[in-house]
């Protein structure tokens, strides 16, 4: 069961996995649900009453019954890992500790204006994992100013201390808010010879990849194939590191791959969701629990509403026995990893769903694109809303995409002449505007985030959000699109859809069912030729055929210009404006969301 | 000792097209991350182009992206700027840089190896 309270002047007996400091239980909390064994936690905050070196101490706990024994203990803060919920978490922390020294290993010392350029530099840096910064009050004259960048073997403090006028944060890497090159590259036949940090067992190079991205001090990896020469080391994924963040070294050998840490790639990819099934590979670990099971992909159910369950492998029913049911193996260990990985046995292993909750929902496969046609079938843009007016009588009013699940983003220029939100219904999972009657159900606006310097579409910023009453519950048919992630800013995308219900030629009406044509993105310099009269702007992006006959019409509106890159789609234009509809050489003009990702985040994540 | 010898530079009139080269001794482009900066008449610093040599990934300034192309000889320790559909706005001082750890790869503050730098004059 979800339990994400915290309890006050509790304290979790016995259970312990390890310490970690960290500078509030919010975050204790977090670190216990990144953890592969953690269900429990105990934190002890500062307090008169308490020993100061135990004051921000984060002590994880584990229990087969899934809880322990509660005990009154004066500043202790207690409480469970989200592993237990379904809703979406992050490992992004924004918060500034004031008055806090989070220590580290102090590796960079340079003077910043401020804590939040400081942060800056740490989000910035791939050693980086928190900082401590001494703000101009600083009793010393030599360390005022100094922004001290910090790493550690875990990513969190090896120990908390108060000390008056430093303030201390955390990297924001794990917010997608990183400017570090995204180097997405798997390299064939290679080994890099650095230092290694770790090693951990894996079926392929991607798991082996992900694996990397999660774990603090990992910058690249080597993965040895199950075709390795060397036995003993098949499936092995060595995390490795070096002092420049680069592979030193690079050597060809047959049967290996390496590739690098995708920490600046975040909220563009899933990184702790391993979702394929290994076909004739056994997972070895310590077994939790045997069931029988109908299908590989039943015991993958199973392994994930188990919440200890990390692994698991499957082995199918020998002819008709059991009712054609086999044997499913819940597993886990110390790291998540299997110990070892067996080939040739006949099983079907795989890993628990659990943690894809700690993506962002919006990298989880969702139905493949159907080809050909221009009519779109459900599910399809599981995250294209229509948004409807009711003032004077209802209406199909613009597109919208959900990014969150309170939040559609669409454009500025749909809300002339809306005096106020609550004239606004969002529909999503909607195919046919047929299908939308009095009593289907809609999400009310509570409120229209405009962007400020929006004038008129042509001019940008046309680019609006839209705070929905209640959230959105993700299903199959309504569920969110990635925001570009500006580590992708140089991208070149080459499979871009636009969609929406508008109109399908100048003089026309709403379509009734959703509309999707594909089209290719021009370049901005491009497109400037195309519109003399009008500047182009960076915060622009163009699509469409030189030819004309596809594009954005009037009621496309707002929707989104989705395009897919390493099988995530990513909202890469909001429809803005155009010349006509489909005309030759008038490509459409979109919002480039990419240069607004910074606005979209204050926006939704203001307090 | 490291040296980045730009060569390349010139005049041309707008629309035309230039080729910068870097020579590096000193420094291996292999494996780091090597880019492309310019800085304008009374402007500061400005990252244009960059390429991690590995793999060859890419990266490129907003304002020259579908006009100018990054590419590098790892075998001759050359890194290339094809610059094509040239604007009188591209008129700059051009730089070749080199980094030495993981950086963001348009970022001039975070690369240690410089050259002299290159002239590009783009008249309209």
């Known amino acids: 069961e979800c339990v994400t309270q915290l309890l006050k002047d509790t304290c979790f007996e016995g259970g312990d996995i390890t310490t970690v400091f960290t500078p509030s239980a919010k975050y204790c909390q977090v670190v216990c649900t990144y953890h592969p064994r953690c269900l429990l936690f105990t934190f002890t905050a500062e307090s008169p009453s308490e020993d100061p070196t135990r004051w921000f101490t984060c002590v994880l706990k584990d229990s087969v019954t899934e809880t322990l024994p509660r005990v009154n203990r004066t500043a202790a803060i207690s409480g469970y890992s989200f592993k237990q919920c379904s809703h979406q978490i992050s490992a992004c922390n924004k918060d500034i500790y004031v008055d806090l020294d989070m220590k580290g290993i102090n590796y960079n010392s340079s003077v910043a204006k401020s804590a939040q350029e400081c942060q800056e530099r740490c989000t910035d840096d791939v050693h980086c994992h928190f900082f401590t910064y001494a703000t101009r009050q600083f009793p010393s004259l030599e360390h005022r100013n100094i922004c001290l960048l910090k790493h550690t073997q875990t990513g969190t403090p090896t120990r908390i201390t108060k000390l008056d006028k430093v303030v201390s944060g955390f990297s924001l890497k794990s917010c997608a808010l990183s400017n570090l090159a995204c180097i997405r590259d798997i390299f064939p036949n290679t080994v890099f010879a650095d230092s290694n940090i770790d090693s951990v067992m894996a079926p392929d190079a991607f798991v082996c990849g992900r694996i990397c991205t999660h774990h603090p001090g990992c910058l690249f990896f080597t993965f040895f194939s199950q075709e390795w020469p060397k036995e003993s080391q098949r499936n092995l994924c060595l995390l490795k590191t070096s002092e420049s963040g680069l592979p030193s070294t690079r050597i060809k050998k047959s049967k290996a791959l390496s590739g690098f840490s995708l920490q600046s790639c975040r909220h563009s990819i899933p990184v702790f969701c391993h979702s394929s099934f290994y076909h004739d590979t056994d997972f070895l670990g310590e077994e939790l629990d045997i069931v029988a099971a109908k299908s590989h992909e039943a015991c993958q159910k199973l392994c994930t509403n188990a919440v200890r369950c990390q692994f698991f492998t499957y082995t199918p029913a020998q002819a008709s026995c059991n009712e054609g049911k086999g044997k499913c193996y819940l597993k886990l260990s110390s790291n998540g990893s299997p110990t070892k990985i067996l080939h040739g046995r006949g099983g079907i292993s795989g890993y628990t769903l659990r943690l894809c909750k700690m993506d962002n929902e919006c990298t989880t496969k969702i139905k493949p694109r159907i080809v050909g046609g221009t009519a779109s079938v459900r599910g399809e843009w599981p995250w294209q809303v229509t948004l409807h007016t009711t003032s004077p009588t209802q209406r199909h009013l613009c597109g919208g995409s959900i990014i969150g699940n309170q939040w559609i983003l669409t454009a500025a220029h749909c809300f002339y002449g809306v005096e106020s939100p609550k004239i606004l219904r969002v529909y999503s999972g909607i195919l046919n505007q047929s299908e939308i009657k009095e009593d289907t159900s809609f999400f009310g606006v509570q409120e229209i985030i405009i962007h400020d310097q929006y004038k008129m579409a042509e001019s940008g910023y046309d680019i609006a959000l839209l705070k929905l009453e209640t959230t959105v519950n993700y299903t199959d048919s309504q569920r969110p699109i990635c925001l570009p992630s500006k580590g992708d800013r140089n991208v070149i995308y080459t499979d871009c859809w636009v969609t929406g219900w508008g109109y399908r030629k100048l003089r026309d009406k709403i379509q009734n069912t959703l509309q999707k044509a594909k089209i290719p993105l021009v370049t901005n310099e491009e497109c400037q030729k195309r519109y003399r009269g009008h500047k182009i702007t960076h915060k622009m992006i163009c699509a469409g055929y030189r030819e004309g006959g596809k594009d954005a019409c009037k009621g496309d509106s707002g929707g989104p210009l989705s395009c897919k890159h390493n099988e995530v789609w990513h909202l890469v234009g909001i429809t803005s404006w155009g010349e006509g509809c489909a005309q030759r050489e008038r490509p459409g003009v979109y919002t480039n969301v990419v240069e607004y990702v910074d606005w979209i985040l204050e926006k939704t994540q203001a307090v | 000792q490291v040296q980045l010898v730009e060569s390349g530079g010139g005049s041309v009139q707008a629309g035309g097209s230039l080729r910068l080269s870097c020579a590096a001794s000193?420094?291996?482009?292999?494996?780091?991350?090597v880019g492309w900066f310019r800085q304008a008449p009374g402007k500061g610093l400005e990252g244009v182009s960059a390429?991690?040599?590995?793999?060859?990934?890419?990266y490129y300034a907003d304002s020259v992206k579908g006009r100018f192309t990054i590419s590098r000889d790892n075998s001759k320790n050359t890194l290339y700027l094809q610059m094509n559909s040239l604007k009188p706005e591209d008129t700059a001082v051009y730089y070749c840089?080199?980094?030495?750890?993981?950086?963001?790869?348009?970022?001039?503050?975070?690369?240690?190896?410089w050259g002299q730098g290159t002239l590009v004059t783009v008249s309209s």
């Open positions: 000193g420094y291996t482009f292999n494996n780091n991350f």
């Open positions: 390429i991690y040599s590995l793999g060859g990934s890419t």
């Open positions: 840089a080199g980094a030495i750890t993981w950086v963001p790869p348009l970022s001039h503050r975070r690369y240690t190896y």
